[in-house]
């Protein structure tokens, strides 16, 4: 029983991935994820 499962993140640019409920922009090299984004194609909180 499906749902509209998407094999990729439907976001502009190549730096988004599914983190939690949403597709989020990942953290840059040398930083770690503090909190995922809270909207589609949003920015994660990175430290």
């Amino acid at each position: 029983q499906g749902g509209t499962r998407s094999p990729r993140c439907d976001c502009a640019g190549d730096f988004h991935k599914k983190i939690g409920l949403f597709c989020c922009r990942g953290c840059p090299a040398g930083h770690y994820l503090k909190a995922p984004c809270t909207e589609p194609c949003g920015n994660s909180t990175c430290l």
Epitope: Q1, G3, T4, R5, A12, L21, E39
Partner: antibody, heavy 119, light 113 residues
């Protein structure tokens, strides 16, 4: 057929605690984000907690943050909501809902379980 | 938080009439990345749980009759029932599925004359 069956609703005094359960069947439970949504006596719908699939992240509105905890047991296909420091305004019908994997709208809902908080 | 405002709060229609209900959000639900509006409509019949009708503002859920039509973009959305049937007696709620906290409108109660 997707089925979500809530249980655990009860009559609780203010300040008390309660744990609700939602048994899921008919789909691969661990592939989907899940939420709890409540409906107050005046019929308003209020989202109260969500949990993602995979590496689990949890989400809460400010109204319940620090008092409610959502969790899941993928081996048991069960979603939970642990509620503490309950207030009269938490009185509601509590539904579990499945998130569509792409849009995050609620594509399936359970039948609900009732929580009454009163002295 | 995104505030969702529905109107009217109730309406009474005769069978076969066209019904329109509105939902307004306090900020845009249009995602510039994918041009999708993150707005859903749910129907709740008396004594039942809510049921998904429409998502992404205009995508009808599988199995939902085609008399239910969602439209709108940005902050203003409409659910239309092209020819109301007796079984459409229900409360209708809009919800933004754009960001947490997910929020709902207060509902439109549809009564049949």
């Amino acid at each position: 057929e997707v089925q979500l069956v809530e249980s655990g609703g009860d009559f609780v005094k203010p300040g008390g605690s309660l744990k609700l359960s939602c048994a899921a069947s008919g789909f691969t439970f661990n592939n989907y984000g899940m939420s709890w949504v409540r409906q107050t006596p005046d019929k308003r719908l209020e989202w109260v907690a969500a949990i993602s699939s995979g590496v689990t992240y949890t989400y809460y509105p400010d109204t319940v943050k620090g008092r409610f905890t959502i969790s899941r047991d993928n081996a048991k296909n069960t979603l939970y909501l642990h509620m503490s420091s309950l207030k009269s305004e938490d009185t509601a019908m509590y539904y579990c809902g499945r998130h569509d994997d792409y849009g995050n709208h609620f594509d399936y809902w359970g039948q609900g379980t009732t929580l009454t908080v009163s002295s | 938080d995104i505030v969702m405002t529905q109107s009217p709060s109730s309406l009474a229609m005769s069978l076969g009439q066209r019904v329109t209900m509105n939902c307004k959000s306090s900020q845009s639900l249009l995602n510039s990345h994918n041009q999708k509006n993150y707005l859903a409509w749910y129907q709740q019949k008396p004594g039942q749980s809510p049921k998904l009708l429409v998502y992404f503002a205009s995508s009808r859920e599988s199995g939902v009759p085609d008399r239910f039509i969602g439209s709108g973009s940005g902050t203003d959305f409409t659910l239309t029932i092209s020819s109301v049937q007796a079984e459409d007696l229900a409360d209708y709620f809009c919800q933004q599925h754009y960001s947490t906290p997910f929020t709902f409108g207060s509902g439109t109660k549809l009564e049949i004359k």
